[in-house]
């Protein structure tokens, strides 16, 4: 059923809820629909590489994933690590480099599977301020070629939450990341389970705001595990 996977991030389940937290450790998160894919929010070269502390894969670059630097190391100390190339061992999709995904513990090409596929991106020029309708002409482009919004405002393309104005976080929106509002009291959230396949969500939500935590809604305690609603509540 639709509700049976509200609190799961596993790709095999569907449809999961729309939207997870964007790089905020210990905060509310929920899976989003459809394809999970390796990605991130910054590009680095080996030459200037410096360990970047992280809590989630979303905080790392396109060619990185978030993990403890040493095998069996302290789970509390995680940094962005270089992605694994084809035929290398993996535990989740985000560990594999772009164009690959984790299958049976090995990074394999996503070209061999419908799992990701090439995604066609069409950017449409709109001759006015209203971008709600996609009129005009289309052209193929890269994801970063045009930003429609002032940096930091809601809807701005961003790399990480520090790029966004106060009250906003940087969260996935299809194959980009945009500034979205931090969740307020009473808004629905889902506890982030670190087990299973946690990839990057297509529709991602922010975390609960300051002074709030994601907890089971009181009147839903009697409901079955699968349909329990979590909301942002005062500590």
């Amino acid at each position: 059923t639709l509700n049976s996977v509200l609190n799961s991030n596993a790709i095999k389940n569907l449809p999961p809820p729309l939207g997870g937290a964007a790089g905020h450790p210990g905060s509310a998160v929920s899976a989003a629909p459809g394809i999970l894919y390796p990605g991130g929010n910054k590009y680095q070269t080996i030459d200037n590489y410096q360990p970047y502390p992280c809590a989630e894969d979303e905080e790392c670059g396109t060619d990185e994933y978030c993990a403890s630097p040493t095998r069996g190391g302290d789970a509390g100390v995680q940094i962005c690590l270089a992605c694994r190339k084809r035929r290398k061992r993996c535990m989740r999709h985000a560990m594999c480099c772009p164009g690959n995904y984790c299958k049976n513990g090995i990074c394999v090409s996503s070209d061999q599977n419908h799992f990701r596929g090439e995604i066609e991106e069409t950017i449409t020029e709109s001759f006015g301020n209203d971008h709600s309708t996609l009129d005009g002409y289309s052209r193929r482009t890269t994801l970063s070629s045009k930003m429609y919004h002032t940096k930091g405002q809601e809807g701005s393309v961003c790399l990480r939450s520090s790029d966004c104005a106060s009250g906003l976080c940087c969260a996935r929106h299809f194959w980009s990341k945009i500034c979205k509002p931090v969740l307020k009291e009473g808004q629905v959230c889902t506890k982030h389970r670190r087990k299973g396949s946690h990839g990057l969500e297509i529709f991602q939500r922010c975390y609960c705001g300051e002074g709030l935590s994601c907890r089971i809604q009181k009147d839903h305690h009697q409901a079955s595990n699968s349909s329990r609603l979590h909301t942002c509540q005062r500590h």
Partner: nanobody, 117 residues
Framework: EVQLVESGGGLVQAGGSLRLSCAAS????????MGWFRQAPGKEHEFVAG????????YYADSVKGRFTISGDNAKNTVYLQMNSLKPEDTAVYYC??????????WGQGTQVTVSS
């Protein structure tokens, strides 16, 4: 609370066409975009196509590129999926989903598309 209602599914022969619609009601916040997803029997949930009002982009999975077209109007809270040259492997329940600025779990109930060979 936002309600998403899909329509337009049905039984069609291979090579035929269908047009799915998804109407959103109860929206009090802005939507960043909407998408279509599908699940075939025994298969994983699959992204089909998406439209971003915020970025002015459309997105397609490889398997439907050139055959399916997503369109819509954010002001009218509606998104469409024009499906041409349908194949038996397109048989699935098609779901509409919305990326809202206020909450996280807006899905329609789905509409069945069956393509016979």
């Amino acid at each position: 609370e936002v309600q998403l209602v899909e329509s337009g599914g049905g039984l069609v022969q291979a090579g035929g066409s269908l047009r799915l619609s998804c109407a959103a009601s109860g929206r009090t916040f802005s939507s960043y975009g909407m998408g279509w997803f599908r699940q075939a029997p025994g298969k994983e949930h699959e992204f089909v196509a998406g439209i971003s009002w915020t970025l002015g982009r459309t997105y397609y999975a490889d398997s439907v590129k050139g055959r399916f077209t997503i369109s819509g109007d954010n002001a009218k809270n509606t998104v469409y999926l024009q499906m041409n040259s349908l194949k038996p492997e397109d048989t699935a329940v098609y779901y509409c989903a919305s990326d809202e600025s206020d909450a996280y779990n807006y899905w329609g109930q789905g509409t069945q598309v069956t393509v016979s060979s």
